[in-house]
Interface confidence: low
């Protein structure tokens, strides 16, 4: 593109299922180009989207993409749920889809939750 | 509901300037890509550009020379203007949106018909 | 520009039948490991309505008798079963590369 705004590629209506217990690194692909933005973290509550201000993040850089990472060391049961990454730059904000996580406990590590109970017990 | 609305002439002489107007409710011009697109008689979509959340521009190349998209975030409106303008112009002229991921233009307006004719 | 090449220009499509149309781009449509490929009806006077994003995501609202497909250069657009609502003028579009482009349309009839 010859724009040089900074994009936030994660895909509408993505997903990731993934085992309590298991390390997991949730990716934001940020593309820039001269200044890397401030990115965040946030996890969906309802409507808000609550930050997550003490988890571990990274960055990882590509060629013609950077990553900026959410750690998970180890995936807990209550990490279920849909996160969504922000970048702030000059006096803008934009925002990337939500992708969600599909927790399954390592109890029932043969059966992957329904959607509607991974909602039901994440809204709970 | 994201809505947006074209408006301005619907004839213009040739050699003239093209004004038009989207007008945005329900979302901010502030976010997302906001763009122009126009349909000729022959049923032709020709994609001409963008103005970003953050204002940067896009232009077709084959229209670079004439074109210019600008905004007013306080009225949350964008504009186009073509400059000299041909019969090879008169089309239906199309504001849509598009996401930061994928870029497909998810809403649009009814479209504005411009004649180009003396 | 990538060139988006439509077929056929039209059909005509019993009612509960299946309609498929294709969409060859003369390029690879694969940005970041994913197809920048979307497709549009548009109704007698009415814009462009969104009907498939990134090749076979359906838009919300959208009946699932609609269908999309494909990667790299070859795309196609399946409507199953054909419904009367469904007369219109079928686009591809890729957002891969500046300047978008659009195909040159499928006009679709019932038999």
């Known amino acids: 593109k010859e724009s040089c705004d900074v994009q936030l590629y994660i895909k509408r209506q993505s997903e990731h299922s993934i085992l309590a217990g298991d390390p997991f690194e949730l990716e934001c692909p940020v593309k820039y180009c001269a200044n890397r933005p401030h990115v965040t973290w946030c996890k969906l509550n309802g409507t808000t989207c609550v930050k997550l201000e003490d988890r571990q993040t990274s960055w990882k850089e590509e060629k013609n993409i950077s990553f900026f990472i959410l750690h998970f060391e180890p995936v807990l049961p209550n990490d279920n749920g849909s996160y969504r990454c922000s970048a702030n730059f000059q006096s803008n904000r934009i925002e990337s889809h939500s992708t969600t996580l599909y927790v399954t406990d390592v109890k029932s590590a043969s059966e992957r939750p329904s959607k509607d109970e991974m909602a039901s017990r994440f809204w709970a | 509901e994201v809505q947006l609305q074209e408006s301005g002439p619907s004839l213009v002489k040739p050699s003239q300037t093209l004004s038009l107007t989207c007008s945005v409710t329900?979302?901010?011009?502030?976010?997302?890509?906001w763009n122009w697109i126009r349909k000729f008689p022959g049923n032709k979509l020709e994609y001409m550009g963008y103005i970003s959340y953050s204002g940067s521009t896009y232009f077709n190349p084959s229209l670079k020379s004439r074109i210019s998209i600008t905004r007013n975030t306080s009225k949350n409106q964008y504009y186009l203007q073509l400059n000299s303008v041909t019969t090879e112009d008169t089309a239906t002229y199309y504001c849509a949106r598009s996401h930061y991921y994928g870029y497909y233009f998810d809403y649009w307006g009814h479209g504005t018909t411009l004649t180009v004719s003396s | 520009d990538i060139v988006l090449t439509q077929s056929p220009a039209s059909l005509a499509v019993s009612l509960g039948q299946r309609a498929t149309i294709s969409c060859r781009a003369s390029?690879?449509?694969?940005?970041?490991?994913?197809?920048?490929m979307h497709w549009y009806q548009q109704k007698a006077g009415q814009p462009p309505k969104l009907l498939i994003y990134?090749?076979?995501n359906l838009e919300s609202g959208i009946p699932a008798r609609f269908s999309g497909s494909g990667s790299r250069t070859d795309f196609t657009l399946t409507i199953n079963p054909v419904e009367a609502d469904d007369v219109a003028t079928y686009y591809c579009?890729?957002?891969?590369?500046?300047?978008?482009?659009f195909g040159g349309g499928t006009k679709l009839e019932i038999k």
């Open positions: 990134r090749a076979s």
């Open positions: 390029e690879t449509i694969d940005s970041y490991g994913d197809s920048l």
């Open positions: 329900g979302d901010s011009i502030t976010s997302a890509y």
């Open positions: 579009q890729q957002t891969d590369e500046d300047p978008y482009t």
